[in-house]
């Protein structure tokens, strides 16, 4: 009689996670009588997957009824495949005995499991940064197989090039993870900007997965401060306003000081949003000129998003002469500010770090 051969026709089989895998095996002879066993791997550490003669294997079913007369088809079907099932499976013929004796093995079938990557999760910096600074965003996705994967970064639809990507582990594994870090330069216009991490994989049928992060979580746009003053009113009061412009986020506290003494403190709330996502806020102070003998130094002190305070000072010169109602002469403002205006004196405090 011909010598028994164990034939595993497929060198490899690829299956999507959650599906069933069919591993084919046939013997060329009924002789010798004895069971088939399926193993994953080789050597003493091999894992028994199915034993025709004994044991309980709830996920494994023989393709052909083992009680079928003259059965030489020992193919099996493994249900609900997971990445952990990946490996090389061997169909091994045993000769009946006490115990059964291993006789011949098939060449093996490598089972690879196609597993979808998890939805990419994009995380930004722990602390906010200001415009012109570079911040890092990290994108992570896990559990995919095979290892080949493509990751791209976009900012407002424009592809980024400054990023570094790692796929782990480097060697063979049942599934893999990807981690990519992109460096993004912030601008003052980035409050409404978005970064997108896009992952493409064979399991996704050309429909990549995306993870997003809003730059609004990462950016701080410090305010510009401006003073304006209305003409003296009939009741010897001057209305001075401090305009806090183009800031983000909204968390802001403004304090008025008259000659170094706190006059009023206000918190910004429920402000309308500018088109670019920033906020403006105007605070005013009525200064009673007749109550002062000397010049009045007004300071608008702004504490934005927990940063060191920014001060802007404004000197109101009190005139010794009686004034004509409605004239400009009761409050005389001397000097120039950095913008070259001659309406008032504008002294930038040494703590005022923002640029105009």
């Amino acid at each position: 009689e011909e010598e028994l051969q164990v034939i595993q026709p497929e060198k490899s089989v690829s299956v999507a996670a959650g599906e069933s895998a069919t591993l084919n095996c046939t013997a060329t002879s009924l002789i010798p009588v004895g069971p088939i066993q399926w193993f994953r791997g080789v050597g003493p550490g091999r894992e028994l997957i199915y034993h025709q003669k004994e044991g309980h294997f709830p996920r494994v079913t023989p393709v052909s009824d083992p009680t079928k007369r003259n059965n030489m088809d020992f193919s099996i079907r493994i249900s609900n495949i997971t990445p952990a099932d990946a490996g090389t499976y061997y169909c091994v013929k045993f000769r009946k005995g006490s115990p059964d004796v291993e006789l011949k093995s098939g060449a093996g079938t490598e089972l690879s499991v196609r597993a979808k990557p998890s939805a990419p999760v994009v995380s930004g910096p722990a602390v906010r940064a200001t415009a012109e600074h570079t911040v890092s965003f990290t994108c992570e996705s896990h559990g995919f197989s095979p290892r080949d994967i493509t990751l791209k970064w976009f900012k407002n639809g424009n592809e980024l090039s400054d990023f570094q990507t790692n796929v782990d582990p480097a060697g063979k594994s049942v599934s893999y993870s990807i981690r990519s870090t992109a460096r993004v330069v912030l601008t003052r216009r980035d409050v409404h900007s978005q970064v997108i991490c896009e992952v493409a994989h064979v399991t996704l049928q050309g429909d990549p997965l995306r993870g997003t992060a809003n730059l609004s979580e990462a950016i701080r746009v410090p305010p510009f401060l401006e003073f304006t003053q209305q003409s003296m009113r009939a009741d010897n009061q001057v209305n001075v306003t401090c305009q806090v412009m183009k800031f983000y986020p909204q968390r802001l506290q403004l304090t008025w000081l008259e000659n170094g003494n706190v006059s009023r403190t206000e918190m910004a709330s429920a402000l309308p949003e500018n088109k670019d996502g920033t906020y403006n806020w105007t605070s005013w102070l009525l200064v009673n000129v007749s109550a002062h003998r000397d010049d009045v130094k007004l300071t608008c002190q702004v504490e934005h998003d927990g940063q060191p305070a920014v001060n802007k000072s404004f000197s109101v010169k009190v005139s010794a002469h009686p004034k004509e109602q409605g004239s400009n002469t009761a409050a005389e403002n001397t000097g120039t500010n950095e913008r070259g205006s001659s309406d008032y004196k504008d002294d930038d405090d040494k703590h005022h770090h923002h640029h105009h």
Partner: antibody, heavy 119, light 110 residues
């Protein structure tokens, strides 16, 4: 290792029925056929029938088709052979045997159950 | 049905001598290159024991003084050198269709 343990001896009157059991161990019960064979005193072997425990498919010797019924209980890995309308010439040792190679052969045998039919 | 006829019905052979038992089928028991004949040994008070399967293949644990041969309708069980423990009744069985047994051959020591 494979073991087939049969129920004890029975004495029955003509016309009665007998049900012999065969409890299997040491292998996956549903993966192999069980055969039933009998042997009258001083006589040869006579094949009665076979059953596939996985789906209860049966094949009977025409001589026994009307009187014998094979069943299995997969929860206890036990096979049963019931013989009805007993006659004195049904007195025999009844064996269960497992077909290990799906060749319709009998690789492993129980020790037998003696059924005596006598008035 | 296929009928199996064994010959002789009984046989006496000296220890160490060759014993030969024949089994003839009423029609061929061959299919797909296999001969569906099996040989059993039954000692007094014991169940039968499988010796040979598919005409010529020794079941594991069976001494190699036993051998089987033949094809189609004519088959032979041979014990090359009879031992005392070989005293038994020997049966052939076919499974080309539903199984049947030969009537048995009683082997004794001369």
């Amino acid at each position: 290792q494979v073991q087939l343990v049969q129920s004890g001896a029975e004495v029955k009157k003509p016309g009665a029925s007998v049900k012999v059991s065969c409890k299997a161990s040491g292998y996956t019960f549903t993966n192999y056929w069980i055969n039933w064979v009998r042997q009258a005193p001083g006589q040869g072997l006579e094949w009665i029938a076979m059953i596939d425990p996985s789906d209860s498919e049966t094949h009977y010797n025409q001589i026994f088709k009307d009187r014998a019924t094979l069943t299995t209980d997969t929860s206890t890995s036990t096979a049963y052979m019931e013989l009805r309308s007993l006659r004195s010439d049904d007195t025999a040792v009844y064996y269960c045997a497992m077909d290990y190679g799906s060749l319709y052969a009998m690789d492993y045998w129980g020790r037998g159950t003696l059924v005596t039919v006598s008035s | 049905d296929i009928v199996l006829t064994q010959s002789p019905d009984s046989l006496a052979v000296s220890l160490g001598e060759r014993a030969t038992i024949n089994c003839r089928a009423s029609k061929s028991v061959s299919s797909s290159g296999y001969n569906y004949i099996f040989w059993y040994q039954q000692k007094p008070g014991q169940p039968p024991k499988l010796l040979i399967y598919l005409a010529s293949n020794l079941d594991p644990g069976v001494p190699d003084r036993f051998s089987g041969s033949g094809s189609g309708t004519d088959f032979t069980l041979t014990i090359s050198s009879l031992q005392a423990e070989d005293v038994a009744v020997y049966y052939c069985q076919h499974s080309r269709e539903l199984p049947t047994f030969g009537q048995g051959t009683k082997l004794e020591i001369k």
